[in-house]
């Protein structure tokens, strides 16, 4: 059997680090057998059998000129094997980032913090840690580790399915190359990394007879699971065409009546979502939808849909502590927003 341990990587390749001493091993001989070493295609003897180094070639302070293929021969001139030297660096700890678009699953992406120049792979796993009691800082013993399944096609991403919202997870991403391994451990709380996808299906419609009103409606993002106790809240922004500044409101449900639109001008509207108890962060903005208030006379009867805003509400603090979640609350899709709205309107 070969005296040369096979490093992870393609066969016949051995590895070293620039600026360091590198030992090459002749694969086709018995350990300790004296051999002669040559560069492939060059007749010059690099190291003779009388070096006292047996089946190994030592290159002091290797640099890029030492990379390439080497040939070792036994005393009788037989081929002991060919070895390709590739220089690079041991892995550095990768950088890891995790995000969740819902409260049941999260994904982690990673990227090398330093390019090693060598064949590299990543091992991904996670453990779950659960807090023992609301006031206790103690944690139960970690459970796991479990593999974090990586995306096919080599994308630097893995996904944890069926995560628990209240649990803390420790993600392990280990970068491995032939010169070693280096691990990044990242503690992840689903609450802190939660960022919903933007709301979908945004529509902006005029309100017949009200030249300063627009009605916007939207739906939950498709990625948000339909559970009654994890709701989203929304933030809506609107502005007339060619106007640089957005006005912001926080609607009570899945629609909003804008009462201070500029008559006759098209308006851009966009909407963002966030966990209703302020876990995580606001989603990105939805694609803009456009609408123009209607022209015409005001009807005698005042419609009651939508909560009417004359000034934006204050945005809640991102870091404010979240109150306990209610155990049961109807899903917003099941609520008729109009039923609970105060039946008051301001004439435009």
């Amino acid at each position: 059997s070969s005296p040369c341990p096979q490093a992870w990587g393609p066969p016949g390749v051995q590895y070293g680090q620039p600026g360091r001493s590198v030992k090459l091993c002749c694969p086709g001989v018995t350990a300790g057998d004296p051999v002669s070493w040559f560069r492939d295609g060059e007749p010059k003897l690099l190291q003779g059998p009388d070096s006292g180094l047996g089946h190994e070639l030592v290159l002091a302070q290797a640099d890029s000129t030492d990379e390439g293929t080497y040939i070792c021969q036994t005393l009788d001139g037989a081929l002991g094997g060919t070895v390709t030297l590739q220089l690079g660096y041991p892995p550095a700890r990768p950088v890891v980032s995790c995000q969740a678009a819902d409260y049941e699953n999260f994904s982690c992406t990673w990227s090398p913090s330093q390019i090693s120049g060598l064949p590299t792979r990543y091992l991904t796993s996670y453990r779950k840690k659960t807090v023992l009691g609301a006031d206790s800082q103690r944690r139960s013993p970690s459970t796991g580790p479990w593999p974090c399944p990586q995306d096919p096609l080599g994308a630097a991403r893995c996904v944890v399915h069926g995560a628990e919202f209240w649990s803390q997870y420790r993600i392990n991403v280990t970068e491995v190359n032939p010169l070693g391994a280096s691990t990044r451990l990242l503690d992840v709380s689903l609450q802190s990394i939660l960022r919903p996808d933007p709301p979908q299906g945004l529509r902006v419609e005029s309100v017949p007879g009200y030249p300063r009103r627009l009605r916007a409606s939207w739906t939950y993002p498709a990625s948000w699971p339909c559970q009654p106790h994890f709701l989203l809240k929304f933030r809506l922004q609107y502005r007339p065409a060619q106007h640089p500044a957005w006005s912001t409101v926080e609607p009570a449900g899945l629609e909003e009546v804008i009462t201070d639109a500029v008559a006759g001008l098209p308006h851009a509207v966009r909407v963002s979502a966030r966990d209703f108890l302020d876990a995580g962060t606001w989603s990105t903005w939805s694609p803009e939808a456009w609408g123009t208030p209607s022209t015409g006379t005001i009807p005698k009867e005042i419609p009651a849909w939508g909560q009417l805003h004359t000034q934006p509400e204050v945005e809640p603090q991102v870091d404010s502590p979240a109150p306990p979640r209610p155990s049961l609350q109807p899903h917003p899709r099941l609520l008729d927003h109009r039923d609970s709205v105060e039946q008051v309107a301001v004439l435009a």
Epitope: A92, R93, V95, V96, S97, T109, W110, S111, P112, S113, Q114, I115, G117, R184, L186
Partner: antibody, heavy 118, light 107 residues
């Protein structure tokens, strides 16, 4: 010669913008994570932002999140810091620094002074 | 974020003295601690990486030790050119943080 050279600093009004650049030479820029660190006059060092070699992951200090953007152009061996909505407390010397790895800085530029004042 | 504290904030010592600076992390950072030297008007310079490893080209009178939360930086024999401010810095977290610095001068 292995070096980093910052540019783009200067005097700007509160709410204004600046773009800092850091030109790298003498090493394989595209192999290393790069970082911006700042130092307010008479104060200590504060990490601002870092970016991985491929540029696909970045990290920011809470004090600049949402206002500053780090980027790199490996074909030009250059690191950037786009600074928007500048505040008086952003006044500092801004240093560009190189890895190894993420969070260790074995090569620093000489710094460029950013002054935010009306 | 991980907080770093350093003591003392400043010190005066004689040439040839042994100087010790301590650094404490608010949580376990393993050995992911660096020490930097910054002379007035200059950029910082990495002296010690990963708690105890001497950066290439740095004189052997500088050394570091410790792991977990408590770390020590030592100048075995203070030289006039060592007048500077010394910073510890953790990189266990992906958001690195520096200590407030220790100013060293000659008596």
């Amino acid at each position: 010669e292995v070096q980093l050279l910052e540019s783009g600093g200067g005097l700007v009004q509160p709410g204004g913008s600046l773009r800092l650049s850091c030109a790298a030479s003498g090493f394989t820029f595209s192999f290393y994570s790069m970082t911006w660190v700042r130092q307010a006059p008479g104060k200590g060092l504060e990490w601002v932002s870092s970016i991985v070699p491929y540029g696909d992951l970045t990290q920011y200090a809470d004090s600049v999140k949402g206002r500053f953007t780090i980027s790199r152009d490996n074909s030009k061996n250059t690191l950037y810091l786009q600074m928007n909505s500048l505040r008086a407390e952003d006044t500092a010397v801004y240093y560009c620094a190189k890895g190894p790895g993420w969070g260790s800085f074995d090569l620093w530029g000489r710094g460029t002074l950013v002054t935010v004042s009306s | 974020d991980i907080q770093m504290t350093q003591s003392p904030s400043s010190l005066s010592a004689s040439v040839g003295d042994r100087v010790t600076i301590t650094c404490q992390a608010s949580q376990d950072i393993n050995n992911y601690l660096n020490w930097y030297q910054q002379k007035p008007g200059k950029a910082p310079k990495l002296l010690i990486y990963d708690a105890s490893n001497l950066q290439t080209g740095v004189p052997s009178r500088f050394s570091g030790s410790g792991s977990g939360t408590d770390f020590t930086f030592t100048i075995s024999s203070l030289q006039p050119e060592d007048i500077a401010t010394y910073y510890c810095q953790q990189h266990e977290s992906q958001s690195p943080t520096f200590g407030p610095g220790t100013k060293v001068d000659i008596k």
